[in-house]
Amino acid sequence: AVDLTLLANLRLTDPQRFFLTCVSGEAGAGRGSDAWGPPLLLEKDDRIVRTPPGPPLRLARNGSHQVTLRGFSKPSDLVGVFSCVGGAGARRTRVIYVHNSPGAHLLPDKVTHTVNKGDTAVLSARVHKEKQTDVIWKSNGSYFYTLDWHEAQDGRFLLQLPNVQPPSSGIYSATYLEASPLGSAFFRLIVRGCGAGRWGPGCTKECPGCLHGGVCHDHDGECVCPPGFTGTRCEQACREGRFGQSCQEQCPGISGCRGLTFCLPDPYGCSCGSGWRGSQCQEACAPGHFGADCRLQCQCQNGGTCDRFSGCVCPSGWHGVHCEKSDRIPQILNMASELEFNLETMPRINCAAAGNPFPVRGSIELRKPDGTVLLSTKAIVEPEKTTAEFEVPRLVLADSGFWECRVSTSGGQDSRRFKVNVKVPPVPLAAPRLLTKQSRQLVVSPLVSFSGDGPISTVRLHYRPQDSTMDWSTIVVDPSENVTLMNLRPKTGYSVRVQLSRPGEGGEGAWGPPTLMTTDCPEPLLQPWLEGWHVEGTDRLRVSWSLPLVPGPLVGDGFLLRLWDGTRGQERRENVSSPQARTALLTGLTPGTHYQLDVQLYHCTLLGPASPPAHVLLPPSGPPAPRHLHAQALSDSEIQLTWKHPEALPGPISKYVVEVQVAGGAGDPLWIDVDRPEETSTIIRGLNASTRYLFRMRASIQGLGDWSNTVEESTLGNGLQAEGPVQESRAAEEGLDQ
């Protein structure tokens, strides 16, 4: 790659002090149109990010290989895209720097994103000053996507770009709708032309394994090293404050590379210099971190110390990135040839090695079939060997295949391959089957067809009352046997599910589908008996019964009364839905009918023993209602009633019954018998003065007949309070004569 660096001075308190410098380490760069080719170009690129025009920027050439841009008068002059072009012919290269306003509405969490072809890139714009409107994403200045302002996650708007390809590269921006571009978050997306670790025309070649955050160039396979590192694999750190492919350049100023952003040829992009981090590259690395943007962790071994610019500084006798390399050929010991684990488990795999120098934790690694390398989390050092323990991330099916344990020391390396089989825990495809049920137990066949891998080691049956939030009860059973769930509640629905397990940690499969199984009711055993009955009309019967006293709760939901009309061959059933009831009124019966009556307790759908039967004769239906009932006040305490006899009488009337009630009163009505059935008039005495009364009457033959119409009448005057109504009757004609 071309040795070209664009430095941006990010000390932003005064824009007039801001400068951009483009430095080339190429031989003869920047000398103009002589034998060495075209000069360095440094300019603001207004094609994508257009900002208000200001005074022209000043370009100054410092010697043969450096050009600086100054003359920024206000912060908005800084916002946008700057580029430096250097190199000759086919090596001509453009380096790009994207500057964001620190006061923008939206700020990028990370400006430069370098991803591999086919990766998912995620651009994250952090809300700095909120606006309640859509966020518009643009790609190279053209509309790309919209997010509603409510779609912010944790104060950030995310643009996900799945399966990115090289044409997706460019400048992306996030802006509130119709806001000034100065308020935008600007990003640079660099998509390598190959997948991870590959380069070349067909991406067939393997990258050298760039260290210290170096990025493999997809065209030539060279590592583009972060500022402050050099070597074909970026394995070597420059001295503090130096950069360039051969560490030949020196950061300006007394504070070294503090406050400078370094932009290098693609696919590297931009970062802080080694040892610095933060949006303005003014923060030193935290302990244990080093390199550009402090993205690297030291993890020094064997007494190495961490330097934030160069990484591990090793004691004598050790070298390597983590001071992990020493002298004699190591050897892997006693590795099993085949291991089996269950899906989604996080097993620990041990790998033991011996050697001189002794293998340490970092020198033993585990490589998965996809090439992922796992580093051990723990090492047990014994006199004759080191055993590295690897905590494997959650296993997926793709992890099945050949794994490799590799040990590397300065004395050499050794490796062993072993097969890993990832098994899928069994999951029932169907619910368990109910074989038989009783009031307090269910017999269940638990073993059903399942997906996943056998063998089945245990079967767990989980059960609890339906719609319950209580914990599930669990019973572990032999796979080949039916299960009896005991001590259940009667007439209760239970949700029952099966869980299958296979051998090994994490062998428990997901619970199968639930099924509802309902226990039976206990059969009611108590026999009621009929206490008595009482005819309340020609079609009404009041029945009462009792139950024997027994200890404990009553097993029953209610009572069933049965009336058998033998003449017509009809049965009438009356459900009394309270087990506490001991009486019932049966209505709508057939007058003049002989019934056989019994009662029995029921529970769910089960009937207990019936009471001994009783025989009841209902009286025939009563006469029709008296006609033309009329009321006439006679005094402040007397009202005369007159009527006409009912028509079409089935027999001689035995009496009339008069009902008296105060109009609007809440009390019970008073019934008065008129025992001389031939009469058609009666006087009701003892009434209250100035009181409105309601009257109606009916006749009786063998049973009471229908009520007449109701009539109203008020007593006269303002007499004393009467004792209560009484009756005197006579023939209507006689009353009229008087």
Partner: antibody, heavy 116, light 107 residues
Framework: EVQLLESGGGLVQPGGSLRLSCAAS????????MHWVRQAPGKGLEWVSS????????LYADSVKGRFTISRDNSKNTLYLQMNSLRAEDTAVYYC?????????WGQGTLVTVSS | DIQMTQSPSSLSASVGDRVTMTCRAS??????LAWYQQKPGKVPKLLIY???TLQSGVPSRFSGSGSGTDFTLTISSLQPEDVATYYC?????????FGQGTQVEIK
């Protein structure tokens, strides 16, 4: 050329359902916010619903909330409006519209009549 | 929710007249306001967005102004083809209500 073509309108009884479609062409459908707007006979425009590019963010006017569902199939460049529990007052010409802020392109509309 | 109110509901003017209509938002909406033109029996068409920016292809006799709650659409010289109903709309976020419209006729 940007084109939006609605379909699926017709006569439906109160309480019934209808699904409107809007076929889009001439632009990258999956990148744009899409909307449904309706216009009752002789009345003004009423915004009905919006859906953002991913399809995961949808918004509704109070008058249709809980009854209408907007969705999109970016692979088919099609916008949908599922209308349930239709009422007489839902009778209108339904337009789909594209937007980056304002509604810059509109379809020709499809008439929905809710009547017994 | 923000309501948009247009006035007048209708107006009649002669060809060549300067015509003005207003749109008021019940709360401030910055300049997130669009004006649409709907000719009889036709589809609405975007005229102006961001309160004052003319949509590409719209004649320069149309202009918009205002911000916050009060907005104006002006036709500097009314033409026969401008007979239509004009709607304003707030569009920065949901809901995106339209005004009830101003109907423009030629005297």
């Amino acid at each position: 050329e940007v084109q939006l073509l609605e379909s699926g309108g017709g006569l439906v009884q109160p309480g019934g359902s209808l699904r409107l479609s809007c076929a889009a062409s001439g632009f990258t459908f999956s990148s744009y916010v899409m909307h449904w707007v309706r216009q009752a006979p002789g009345k003004g425009l009423e915004w009905v619903s919006s859906i953002y590019p991913s399809g995961g963010w949808t918004l509704y006017a109070d008058s249709v909330k809980g009854r209408f569902t907007i969705s999109r199939d970016n692979s088919k460049n099609t916008l949908y409006l599922q209308m349930n529990s239709l009422r007489a007052e839902d009778t209108a010409v339904y337009y789909c519209a594209r937007a980056v802020g304002p509604f810059d392109y509109w379809g020709q509309g499809t008439l929905v009549t809710v009547s017994s | 929710d923000i309501q948009m109110t247009q006035s007048p509901s209708s107006l009649s003017a002669s060809v060549g007249d300067r015509v003005t209509m207003t749109c008021r938002a019940s709360q401030g909406i910055g300049t997130y306001l669009a004006w649409y033109q709907q000719k009889p029996g036709k589809v609405p068409k975007l005229l102006i967005y961001a309160a004052s920016t003319l949509q590409s292809g719209v004649p320069s006799r149309f202009s918009g102004s205002g911000s916050g709650t009060d907005f104006t659409l002006t036709i500097s010289s009314l033409q026969p083809e401008d007979v239509a109903t004009y709607y304003c709309q707030k569009y920065n976020s949901a809901p995106r209500p339209f005004g009830q419209g101003t109907q423009v006729e030629i005297k």
